[in-house]
Interface confidence: low
């Protein structure tokens, strides 16, 4: 392949270079020079849940050649490069995003991050962005959706009119119910008995730590929280844990109940201002053996 001067001729090449300043290719924002810009807003924050996947975006604006961008995590006054972590580029019409992937988010991912770009031997650093990670107990032990669906639990959904009194009333009713039907226990079919025992045993074997999660969006607090770019909203999750009564013997009647744990938003108390709590749901199972 012929070189550029050979194709253009020396005179034509001169005019190309002469015209370059008048072309708008150096401009990124009108009169501003075409420097790389990293659009992470100062004081930006993300509240995320441990166990979830998360993508941390570094919006990058460049003109011709895409710069080499890296992520680092702040540790005191130094920023430790995250070279072994999965990253990717997302290209859009006017801006590109250099993404740091969390698959999934771990509790120790809590902290401040910064992206930096090498551009024409200059190092350009972004503002830092902070991840607030809310830890969820036994996030790795959650049953799959299929597993949850296959469990033949009879759930009586009770209106959340008052947590503890309702629970006590439910337990009392169940106790009376069990007492009333104690004489008729032998009349239960083998199949039903086996099925319910199986559920009870399955629950015990897993220490009954099943969790379901639901997403809800919470508005940013009215103090000066930045970007929350994007952002401007963060995801808060509520975990529900299923418990069995550990004091019951294997083949005795038992109660399994579920209660919702409302997760408190992490270290930044400012974020909790506009959170509306969802009603607590209680479900009970009358287990007969």
């Amino acid at each position: 392949m012929k070189t550029l001067p050979a194709m253009l001729g020396t005179g034509k090449l001169f005019w190309v270079f002469f015209l370059i300043p008048y072309l708008d290719i150096w401009n990124i924002h009108g009169k501003e020079s075409c420097d790389v810009q990293l659009y992470i807003k100062r004081q930006s924050e993300h509240s995320i849940l441990a166990g979830d996947p998360f993508e941390l975006e570094c919006p990058v604006k460049y003109c011709a050649n895409r710069p080499h961008v890296t992520w680092c995590k702040l540790n005191g006054t130094t920023c430790v490069k995250l070279e072994d972590r999965q990253t990717s580029w997302k290209e859009e019409k006017n801006i590109s995003f250099f993404i740091l992937h969390f698959e999934p988010v771990l509790p120790n991912d809590n902290g401040s991050y910064r992206c930096s770009a090498n551009f024409q031997s200059n190092l350009i650093e972004s503002h830092s962005t902070t991840l607030y990670v809310t830890d969820v107990k036994s996030a790795s032990e959650r049953p799959s959706k299929d597993e949850m669906a296959s469990r033949p639990w009879l759930l009586y959904r009770l209106l959340p009119l008052g947590g503890l009194p309702l629970l006590i009333t439910t337990c009392f009713c169940l106790f009376c119910c069990l007492r009333r039907h104690q004489g008729k226990q032998n009349e239960l079919s083998d199949t039903a008995g086996r099925e319910i025992n199986l559920v009870d045993a399955h629950l015990k074997s897993e220490q009954t730590e099943a969790s379901t999660r639901q997403n809800s969006q919470v508005l940013l607090s009215e103090t000066g929280i930045y970007d929350n770019d994007p952002d401007l909203c963060f995801r808060m999750q509520e975990g529900s844990e299923v418990y069995s009564n550990p004091c019951l013997e294997e083949n005795k009647p038992g109660i399994v109940y579920a209660s919702l744990n409302h997760s408190v938003i992490g270290p930044n108390s400012r974020l909790a201002r506009n959170v509306k709590e969802a009603p607590t749901e209680y479900a009970s199972i009358c287990v007969r053996s």
């Epitope: 659009y39 019409k93 006017n94 801006i95 000066g224 929280i225 930045y226 401007l232």
Partner: antibody, heavy 120, light 107 residues
Framework: EVQLQESGPSLVKPSQTLSLTCSVT????????WNWIRKFPGNKLEYMGY???????YYNPSLKSRISITRDTSKNQYYLQLNSVTTEDTATYYC??????????????WGQGTSVTVSS | DVQITQSPSYLAASPGETISINCRAS??????LAWYQEKPGKTNKLLIY???TLQSGIPSRFSGSGSGTDFTLTISSLEPEDFAMYYC?????????FGGGTKLEIK
């Protein structure tokens, strides 16, 4: 050069909705933050809110129940809607770009402003 | 909200003089204060951001200083085109707030 131009009715009746458009040239509204500010008679300036490159918004709490900022990226325009206006909303309305990056952050480009009178 | 008190609200000076305009925040805003110039029929011009950084294209006779709660805009050797309205604005936390303005007039 980045230019912003406000447009909309100069007279709005009380209890009606004030609707303004900011047309942007020289930059894309899919980068940066795009703001609305107003100046009351007597020169008091009030920050109203922003629309970000991603489409997220922030509204001044004093206006939260009445304000909406939206955009049309194909036209490179963003909009202000202020519901249930009163004579207190009589002001000059400005749109401005908030530029932020590795080097600096500030509202570096403003529109000329459009004067809106709320009167019956 | 952060309250910004700007003083004086009116200032008369002659070309060649040096003047100062002050802004005080109701609480610390770190270094995040910007200064703007407003002229009739023109768009607002950013002069200073982050307390002391001169915006590109602004003459060096404009300077900003201060951090925390107290900030000053100084214009040395006033030029005829400097007579205008000046505002300060904190950009440390939302909602951003402005000073009441200073009208700089020719004496």
């Amino acid at each position: 050069e980045v230019q912003l131009q406000e447009s909309g009715p100069s007279l709005v009746k009380p209890s009606q909705t004030l609707s303004l458009t900011c047309s942007v040239t020289g930059d894309s509204i899919t980068s940066g933050y795009w703001n609305w500010i107003r100046k009351f008679p007597g020169n008091k300036l009030e920050y109203m809110g922003y629309l970000s490159y991603s489409g997220s918004t922030y509204y001044n709490p004093s206006l939260k129940s009445r304000i909406s900022i939206t955009r049309d990226t194909s036209k490179n325009q963003y909009y202000l809607q202020l519901n249930s206006v009163t004579t207190e909303d009589t002001a000059t309305y400005y749109c401005a770009r908030y530029f932020y990056g590795s080097y600096y952050e500030a509202m570096d480009y403003w529109g000329q402003g459009t004067s809106v009178t709320v009167s019956s | 909200d952060v309250q910004i008190t700007q003083s004086p609200s009116y200032l008369a000076a002659s070309p060649g003089e040096t003047i100062s305009i002050n802004c005080r925040a109701s609480k610390s805003i770190s270094k995040y204060l910007a200064w703007y110039q407003e002229k009739p029929g023109k768009t607002n011009k950013l002069l200073i951001y982050s307390g002391s950084t001169l915006q590109s294209g602004i003459p060096s006779r404009f300077s900003g200083s201060g951090s925390g709660t107290d900030f000053t805009l100084t214009i040395s050797s006033l030029e005829p085109e400097d007579f205008a309205m000046y505002y300060c604005q904190q950009h440390n936390e939302y909602p951003w707030t402005f000073g009441g303005g200073t009208k700089l007039e020719i004496k």
